[in-house]
Amino acid sequence: IWELKKDVYVVELDWYPDAPGEMVVLTCDTPEEDGITWTLDQSSEVLGSGKTLTIQVKEFGDAGQYTCHKGGEVLSHSLLLLHKKEDGIWSTDILKDQKEPKNKTFLRCEAKNYSGRFTCWWLTTISTDLTFSVKSSRGSSDPQGVTCGAATLSAERVRGDNKEYEYSVECQEDSACPAAEESLPIEVMVDAVHKLKYENYTSSFFIRDIIKPDPPKNLQLKPLKNSRQVEVSWEYPDTWSTPHSYFSLTFCVQVQGKSKREKKDRVFTDKTSATVICRKNASISVRAQDRYYSSSWSEWASVPCS
Amino acid sequence: RNLPVATPDPGMFPCLHHSQNLLRAVSNMLQKARQTLEFYPCTSEEIDHEDITKDKTSTVEACLPLELTKNESCLNSRETSFITNGSCLASRKTSFMMALCLSSIYEDLKMYQVEFKTMNAKLLMDPKRQIFLDQNMLAVIDELMQALNFNSETVPQKSSLEEPDFYKTKIKLCILLHAFRIRAVTIDRVMSYLNAS
């Protein structure tokens, strides 16, 4: 058993049928010695008397808010949460496995640049009695500071019969140098509590590996005289790290017909313009990627050919 | 990317072209190592990230773009003890800092070159003959060093009398390649920045 926060405790249980559970001793936070009784949650049934209460915690029915009283007055509370260990592996019931980029990916994180700011998000089908708390650091043995905000509900989606809820959090490394070569990964830890169930999820990454630039901005077409060709031009996104000659991007320009089946023409360039053939009803899209470190491509910025 | 690429002319700055080749070569070598050594811990998540140039060179600090010198977090430890001649500087008037930067890059390359050559000698003794260093990568390191053209003491190749532990050598190869790729990215950024300025 360990303390999650004041008066909230997590009991770690080896989770299998008929498991013996864990013996827990609760102590009433009071100078009083006599006439103390204990109850669980809203029930008035007296579980025991005395300054300490010894319980065997086996299942969720044994968890909850234990309260010690004296003469009708509440003296203190202890909330017990359960953390299930199933065959040596901590349970992951609360969050959904996003399976991208690999199995058992519960937290996904992205950064728009090298400033040390990043966003993480996760999915759940649970709509109520749910709280999250996020901590982060650079490295784990001698951690350096990363400040995270509060997790907020950022999207709701309908997936088949189920509603899916997306939560996200923004974090900022306290003293980040965009040009630094990372040798210690960022660690992100999310505590999730659903009713009386506690779970924790972690992700470890280098900012360089989670970079996903915003799409190029000011995408424009300039028709070339007496030709089906157009000059496409664009600019670096505002959110990208500067100077751009140091933090350079490379671009992919795509000409896509109205039908998804039509052949896509693609050109790769390090410049912020390209000459392409504009077909009728086609659209031109441009996306960006770090020129020197191949992390994710940005989303496409698009304009119609007409 | 095996697709048409419109590449800018390296122009007056001969090192840019070499640094691009270097990044391509080390990335290819790392990919090959990951595939060949699939039963070894060779991914970014599994290895310890060690920098053999730590406390010996300070490329990131010495080569910091002017725009980032205002960032307190980037100014931890600026070294100022490098040699100041080099052919990449020939065509333009350069600052003392730029000379320090290029000389720091040269020292990095020299250290990695020695490590890789020592490692290759060990790998050639492996009866499994599982992996060797790409000669193209070693050649590209050499070409960039020649383009930088700094006079510097030659570092003798490390020789070891004891029987090599091939498992450890292959893991060390992965560690070195990951670190060298990160340094190659920095070098490419620096060359691109210097070329633009």
């Epitope: 299998y16 049928p17 008929d18 199933e86 019931d93 | -």
Partner: antibody
């Protein structure tokens, strides 16, 4: 004490269907994940499927994906395996078992797919 | 598609020490704990070892398990006639958890 009693096995022709049941008692069935494991005659153990405690997630071996469906009725304390498009290679003793560091197995039920 | 490899058979005389190996990789044994089962003819498997080296109550202490890196082993010190059975190791794999990953199985024969 924990008990898992299996039923539903038998002889069936290729292409036909069969539903296995596993009745649980002696524990809070709705709190635990459950597996199906099979063993072909004279062969080793092969995992077939898993279902979470609340039925929210199901996982299948590639060899049965799209043909077998694992389900549970927590109000009846029963686990099911619906087997469709049966093949000769599905012939085996099928076991249900609890998920956890200590596990409990059903007695096994024989499924024979033969024409 | 067994990824955990066991020797097909091992044998020993009563009182001898018998060991069974179970070889895997970084994504299975290297990442998860290992269990060992004993299966007597015509019966369901019985758990002998969980968590690499833990014995459930009721399992004789002549059975012991260990794990090192990407392989595990089961030792029977002072093998007895009633130990003649099939033995299976079991773990998980990073790519497929919670699918159970079983070893190929080992037939233990007690001679004499």
């Amino acid at each position: 004490q924990v008990q898992l009693v299996q039923s539903g096995g038998g002889v069936v022709q290729p292409g036909r269907s069969l539903r296995l049941s596993c009745a649980a008692s002696g524990f809070t069935f709705s709190s635990y994940g459950m597996h199906w494991v099979r063993q072909a005659p004279g062969k080793g153990l092969e995992w077939v499927a898993f279902i979470r405690y609340d039925g929210s997630n199901k996982y299948y071996a590639d060899s049965v994906k799209g043909r077998f469906t694992i389900s549970r009725d927590n109000s009846k304390n029963t686990l099911y395996l619906q087997m469709k498009s049966l093949r000769a290679e599905d012939t085996a003793v099928y076991y249900c078992k609890t998920h956890g560091s200590h596990d409990n197995w059903g007695q096994g039920t024989m499924v024979t797919v033969s024409s | 598609s067994y990824v955990l490899t066991q020797p097909p058979s091992v044998s020993g005389t009563p009182g001898q020490r018998v060991t069974i190996s179970c070889s895997g990789g970084r994504s299975n044994i290297g990442s998860y704990t290992v269990k060992w089962y004993q299966q007597l003819p015509g019966t369901a498997p019985k758990l002998l070892i969980y968590g690499n080296d833990q014995r459930p109550s009721g399992v004789p202490d002549r059975f012991s398990g260990s794990k090192s890196g990407t392989s595990a082993s089961l030792a029977i010190t002072g093998v007895q006639a009633e130990d003649e059975a099939d033995y299976y190791c079991q773990s998980y794999d990073r790519g497929t958890h919670p699918a159970l990953l079983f070893g190929t199985g080992t037939k233990v024969t007690v001679l004499g």
